[in-house]
């Protein structure tokens, strides 16, 4: 009786179970009663990443330099090429099909996480006691100067964008 289901790494064709082609190979001809499945290796710049019955291999992804893309990991017969973005740019999606500039954190915000080729700068607001007076893609919020440790007093309060201003203590006491 012809099978209705096949084992793992097999497929059903013409009422019989044939072996799937291994990753990196494509199907040339199905098996018969007398012959095994015929598979051929993928060509240069092609791949198949699963056990398959595909008659054509997939083209490796092209990392278009005009879009700011470059090869992070070269593809093999079993894996696709992985693209990333040039320095100072990051991917707009997980598929990394185009790149955008890293953003800077505005004054009042500090860098929580520096950008990479695949993720943008993550900014955070400077909490009370901290400030950032620059637009930067790597500077964290800085703590306000401690006037007391310098034997000075606060003459002007700090904000999230400015440091405190220290001054000499008033020596005249009642």
């Amino acid at each position: 009786e012809p099978p209705t289901a096949c084992r793992e790494k097999q497929y059903l064709i013409n009422s019989q179970c044939c072996s799937l082609c291994q990753p990196g190979q494509k199907l040339v001809s199905d098996c018969t009663e007398f012959t095994e499945t015929e598979c051929l290796p993928c060509g240069e710049s092609e791949f198949l990443d699963t056990w398959n019955r595909e008659t054509h291999c997939h083209q490796h992804k092209y990392c278009d330099p005009n879009l700011g893309l470059r090869v992070q990991q070269k593809g093999t017969s079993e894996t696709d090429t992985i693209c990333t973005c040039e320095e100072g740019w990051h991917c707009t999606s997980e598929a990394c099909e185009s790149c955008v500039l890293h953003r800077s954190c505005s004054p009042g915000f500090g860098v929580k996480q520096i950008a990479t080729g695949v993720s943008d700068t993550i900014c955070e607001p400077c909490p009370v006691g901290f400030f950032s007076n620059v637009s930067s893609a790597f500077e964290k919020c800085h703590p306000w100067t401690s006037c007391e440790t310098k034997d000075l007093v606060v003459q002007q309060a700090g904000t999230n964008k400015t440091d405190v201003v220290c001054g000499p203590q008033d020596r005249l006491r009642a």
Epitope: P65, N66, L67, G68, E86, E87, G88, W89, T92, S98, C99, V100, L101, H102, R103, S104, T121, S135, S136, A137, F138, E139
Partner: antibody, heavy 115, light 112 residues
């Protein structure tokens, strides 16, 4: 055909403002980054600034807020707004496509700043 | 800001000559170096990117080399169409959110 076409140049008085346009065809501004590059008469090339596919911008350090790059995706057009113009801003202004290099250029538009 | 020093500023050569133009960056730019050709009244045309990659449609007599701070453009056998001005261009990201695209001063290749 893939191309960039600049327009909006002309004679302008010092201190004046001017907006240049760069109409692109054959590709989308929501996919590619485009820069403005200028060239003073008989001089070399100088980068002005860039707008990325998401609308983010970066400028040359000398720009100091005088110039602003923007775009209108529906018109597939890029703009360079130039304020407080000086004689030394006299140049041919090109738009050029690319991220770390410029593989496609427009023909340029001449801006003359003179009284 | 990064400074690109290109030399020579003018070069006299004959058809068939091997021509070399150099560009020096004031700090390391890895391989972020491009070369352009410009003819009078025309826009620049990309020849080489990433220091040594030949742009599409550019004849193989043009080649680029170098990394870090020293770069070279070579024309193996100068053709009549190659008399023009050549510019190098660096890309540099400071890591602080500032971007720099700096051009060299140009090299005019003229007929000897």
């Amino acid at each position: 055909e893939v191309q960039l076409v600049e327009s909006g140049g002309g004679l302008i008085q010092p201190g004046g403002s001017l907006r240049l346009s760069c109409a692109v065809s054959g590709f989308s501004l929501s996919t590619y980054a485009v820069s403005w590059v200028r060239q003073a008469p008989g001089k070399g090339l100088e980068w002005v600034g860039i707008i990325d596919s998401g609308g983010g911008t970066a400028y040359a350090s000398w720009v100091k807020g005088r110039f602003t790059i923007s775009r209108d995706n529906s018109k597939n057009t890029l703009y360079l707004q130039m304020n407080s113009l000086r004689a030394e801003d006299t140049a041919v202004y090109y738009c050029a496509r690319g991220v770390t290099f410029f593989g496609l250029w427009g023909q340029g538009t001449l801006v003359t700043v003179s009284s | 800001d990064i400074v690109m020093t290109q030399s020579p500023s003018t070069l006299s050569a004959s058809v068939g000559d091997r021509v070399t133009i150099t560009c020096q960056a004031s700090q390391s730019i890895s391989n972020y170096l491009s070369w352009y050709q410009q003819k009078p009244g025309k826009a620049p045309k990309l020849l080489i990117y990433r220091a040594s990659d030949l742009a599409s449609g550019v004849p193989s007599r043009f080649s680029g080399s170098g990394s870090g701070t020293e770069f070279t453009l070579t024309i193996s056998s100068l053709q009549p169409d190659d008399f023009a001005t050549y510019y190098c261009q660096a890309y540099y990201y400071s890591g602080g959110g500032s971007y720099d695209y700096a051009f060299g001063g140009g090299t005019k290749v003229e007929i000897k």
